[in-house]
């Protein structure tokens, strides 16, 4: 008799677990920026503080009738999803509500900013345990709202936002597009994207993961013991805020980067039917449904990585795309992808003290994406080694020459624009262990890292016959850090990582032209972290 | 994730002809004006003036006051609704859009964003 959404996100082994920190009281506090709420509801009574914060625009229309239960509906339901006694994800969590949405569910960017500042002030006046901020709202892209989220996140606050219900690219909305927030899309009981009338959940590279958001049973403001079902990315975000609150309740020192990586790593993979999303967004949208991860004590020092896509570069000749990792994460590899196949490769460079992944469009190309592999590598020391393009006919070799450094990724960037002239780069794991090998006109970049117990190996898989893509997966216990495509003479669209799978894409028109001897190879660099071991390259 | 997607950024580096004040004329606006790409969601008349990150507390207040003073010289009344100190330096103002050019030329201003609606999801 447990509601479907709780069954979905809380694995069986967690069902009986108490949402309490070791001292018996949950120190996590969730701030909800939403409508007013009915604090006297059985689900949330005694665990919700209704702050005096109120920054909302006037309701539209002269005949608008303010009915308390309707004004409180959205916020009460979300408060119940986060910490409700019976239908909540994190049942023991205390919640503070700030009113930034009016009785019609409308607010302003400025009101939201003042709300976020109120939280920061509260934090400064009375420092407490971990803070989670739930933003179940969305407006158009706002540089300042995203910046405010960034500033608050850098103080240690975890922000969770709704992806938006516009059946559109979440990157066009704020706070969903802020990289520092955990952005959540909505799925239904069948793990499919939520449709809401003619619209539905947002999608794209700005979504971190999905969570239940259709027909969610939760507190109804109609009465103190009433329940109702509501749908939307707000409900999905509330589930993730609850999961985060439970994670922090067990382990209060988890950082935003660790939380996000763990949410991604332990989510349910590949259950969403991606055909629901527009074709150009399918590769960018994560196929992940949130579940409550086990504690770090149960899972040990796993190497956790995620894939971060850049914005599209645009079609101009010298257009570049940039993908960035979070400040705490290490950029272990950089690849690129172009739907037309016209790209000049990718490389890693330092901008303002941070390594970033860059990709360059080619003449006649429709634009490129840079694809960064961002990982949590404790006590890592990473560097980039690059070699300029070799003279015609010569190979370029780059390897990790520092002691105890291992190769985690390779990037290749071509100086020439003529795609027909150049031969593609290659990775050779057998002949030259731990080397990136480039060919004519390619600059080669090797990402080399030293970390206690870090070991890596190359895994390749080639297909000779016609194929749109070639994949290679890292086996259990290993994590994909680098992904490249090593083609024969054909035009490749590029390579990218999907969870632990390296995907190499080949141009449609190139498939028929290829002879059986010119295999397209997906080359994965798989690493693992064994804290007791020495850094090593596995052949 | 933070690249400016479907977003309007307008350069309003307007020459200050109507006012011969030396400090004003000397400061060429490099700040930009931004607003929501969805017209129906815009709230013209309310603006978030975002100052450079290193701007000190006193400078925020001075900038807001300077804007009020200069607007008054032109016969405009502007209302400072809120001053942001803790998350970012800036202030929220209610004013005519006629004053945007003037506001963008103020020292310390990084950009100005027109207020807009957000919605429950």
């Amino acid at each position: 008799s447990i509601p479907w959404n709780l069954e979905r996100i809380i694995p069986a082994w967690h069902q009986t677990e108490e949402d309490r920190s070791p001292d018996g009281s949950s120190q996590v506090e969730v701030y909800l920026l939403d409508t007013s709420i009915q604090g006297a509801h059985r689900e949330i009574e005694g665990r919700v503080t209704i702050t005096d914060f109120n920054s909302v625009p006037e309701e539209d229309g002269t005949r608008f009738h303010r009915q308390a239960s309707k004004c409180d509906s959205h916020g009460t339901h979300l408060a119940g999803v986060v910490s409700g006694r019976d239908a909540g994800v994190a049942k023991g969590t205390s919640l503070h509500s700030l009113r930034v949405l009016n009785c019609q569910g409308k607010g302003t960017v400025s009101g939201t900013l003042i709300g976020l500042e109120f939280i920061r002030k509260s934090q400064l006046i009375q420092p407490s345990g971990p803070l989670v901020v739930l933003l179940p709202l969305a407006g158009g892209y706002s540089r300042i709202l995203n910046a405010a989220c960034r500033h608050l996140a850098r103080t240690g606050v975890v922000l969770v936002a709704a992806a938006g219900n516009f059946r559109d690219d979440a990157c066009l909305y704020s706070p969903a597009s802020a990289p520092e927030v955990i952005t959540v899309g909505a799925t239904n009981a069948q793990d499919q994207p939520v449709t809401l009338g003619t619209l539905g959940t947002n999608f794209g590279r700005c979504v971190d993961l999905f969570a239940p958001g259709k027909d969610i049973i939760g507190a109804s403001s109609d009465c103190s013991t009433c329940f109702m079902s509501q749908s939307g990315t707000s409900q999905a975000a509330a589930h993730v805020a609850g999961i985060v609150a439970r994670m922090l309740s067990r382990e209060p020192t988890l950082t935003l980067a660790e939380l996000r990586q763990r949410l991604i790593h332990f989510s349910t993979k590949d259950v969403i039917n991606m055909a629901w999303f527009p074709e150009d967004q399918q590769v960018l949208t994560p196929n992940l449904v949130a579940t409550l991860p086990p504690s770090t004590h149960e899972t040990g020092g796993q190497l956790l990585c995620r894939t971060v896509w850049s914005a599209h570069s645009g079609p101009t000749r010298t257009a570049t795309a940039t993908a960035r990792c979070a400040p705490e994460e290490e950029l272990l590899s950089c690849s690129s992808f172009s739907r037309s196949g016209r790209r000049r490769g990718d490389w890693i460079e330092a901008i303002g003290g941070q390594q970033v992944c860059k990709a360059l469009n080619a003449f006649g190309g429709e634009g490129v994406y840079a694809v960064a592999r961002c990982c949590l590598v404790p006590r890592a020391n990473c560097s980039i080694h690059n070699t300029p393009a070799a003279r015609a006919g010569l190979e370029t070799h780059v390897h990790c020459h520092q002691k105890d450094h291992v190769l985690t990724g390779c990037s290749f960037h071509w100086e020439v624009e003529d795609l027909s002239v150049r031969r593609q780069p290659a990775l050779r794991s057998r002949r030259q262990p731990g080397q990136c090998v480039g060919h004519q006109a390619a600059s080669v970049y090797a990402s080399c890292c030293h970390a206690p117990g870090l070991e890596c190996k190359i895994k390749e898989h080639g297909i000779s016959g016609p194929s749109e893509q070639v994949t290679v997966a890292c086996e259990a216990g290993w994590t994909l850090t680098g992904c490249n495509v090593l083609p024969g003479a054909s035009l490749t669209l590029g390579a990218y990582s999907v969870d632990n799978l390296c995907v190499a894409r080949v141009h449609d028109t190139a498939r028929a032209d290829r002879t059986s001897g010119e295999a397209t190879v997906a080359a994965a660099i798989c690493c693992r972290s064994r804290p007791s071991a020495k850094a090593s390259w596995v052949q | 994730q933070d690249e400016d997607g479907d977003y309007e950024e307008l350069m309003l580096a307007l020459p200050s002809q109507e006012d011969g004040l030396a400090d004003e004329a000397a400061h060429v606006a490099t700040a930009t004006f931004r607003r929501c790409s969805k017209e129906a969601w815009r709230l013209p008349g309310t603006y978030i003036v975002v100052l450079m990150e290193e701007t000190q507390r006193l400078q925020i207040e001075q900038t807001a006051h300077r804007l009020q003073t200069r607007a008054a010289r032109r016969g405009y009344v502007i209302k400072v609704l809120h001053i942001f100190y803790d998350l970012f330096p800036g202030f929220l103002v209610k004013m005519s859009s006629d004053l945007l050019g003037l506001a963008l030329k103020l020292p310390h201003v990084e950009y100005i964003e027109e207020d807009s609606f957000v919605f429950a999801q």
Partner: antibody, heavy 126, light 106 residues
Framework: QLQLQESGPGLVKPSETLSLTCTVS??????????WAWIRQPPGKGLEWIGS???????YYNPSLKSRVTISVDTSKNQFSLKLSSVTAADTAVYYC??????????????????WGQGTLVTVSS | EIVLTQSPATLSLSPGERATLSCRAS??????LAWYQQKPGQAPRLLIY???NRATGIPARFSGSGSGTDFTLTISSLEPEDFAVYYC????????FGGGTKVEIK
């Protein structure tokens, strides 16, 4: 079918703590579909809800009695209990236990009280 | 708290007659109102919930109506076993009961 039975002392001295237990038979107390409630009725007067608990021990109380009430649950015995501290003559009443549908699982039925125990009279007197 | 006022306090009627009982709330309780029947020495029994829905096993002669602040319980034709005390109860804001209406034989 589900039955509830109240038990406990019929006489309590003023300023002491009233303690009652409700034993559930014909069904399990362990269900997300229900809360378990205490309701009282002073002689010749109306009914007053005291508070409710679910099988996980999550409680909520009548705000006017909250400071004096503790409700607990023992799932191993299929029982829940009421403690009312600092009693006075005004606490003299027939005390009923009842099942309350939680409303979380719509199939469980309407969110009201029923079935009830037959009630036990508690007199507060020295 | 929401106060429920029942009227009349006592209703004297004969079997076969129609009984109309009233319950007024101090503020809107929407449709979150129930009616219970209590016979001497017995626990209350749920008759009507959510203002107008009959509980399982309750005869069709019992009906409820109203919303907001004014509610009515109607017994279309009194049977001998219907003579009892009737309570209304709201759940809009926690739980409160009315003072009761006693339906007695005339």
């Amino acid at each position: 079918q589900l039955q509830l039975q109240e038990s406990g002392p019929g006489l309590v001295k003023p300023s002491e703590t009233l303690s009652l237990t409700c034993t559930v038979s014909g069904g399990s107390i362990v269900s997300s579909s229900y809360y378990w409630a205490w309701i009282r009725q002073p002689p010749g007067k109306g009914l007053e809800w005291i508070g409710s608990i679910n099988y996980k021990g999550s409680t909520y109380y009548n705000p006017s009695l909250k400071s004096r009430v503790t409700i607990s649950v023992d799932t191993s015995k299929n029982q829940f209990s009421l403690k009312l501290s600092s009693v006075t003559a005004a606490d003299t009443a027939v005390y009923y236990c009842a099942r309350e549908n939680s409303g979380v699982v719509p199939a469980a039925g309407p969110n009201w009280f029923g079935p009830w125990g037959q009630g036990t009279l508690v007199t507060v007197s020295s | 708290e929401i106060v429920l006022t029942q009227s009349p306090a006592t209703l004297s009627l004969s079997p076969g007659e129609r009984a109309t009982l009233s319950c007024r709330a101090s503020q809107s309780v929407s449709s979150y109102l129930a009616w219970y029947q209590q016979k001497p020495g017995q626990a209350p029994r749920l008759l009507i919930y959510d203002a107008s829905n009959r509980a399982t096993g309750i005869p069709a002669r019992f009906s409820g109506s109203g919303s907001g602040t004014d509610f009515t319980l109607t017994i279309s034709s009194l049977e001998p076993e219907d003579f009892a005390v009737y309570y209304c109860q709201q759940r809009r804001n926690w739980f409160t009961f009315g003072g009761g209406t006693k339906v007695e034989i005339k």
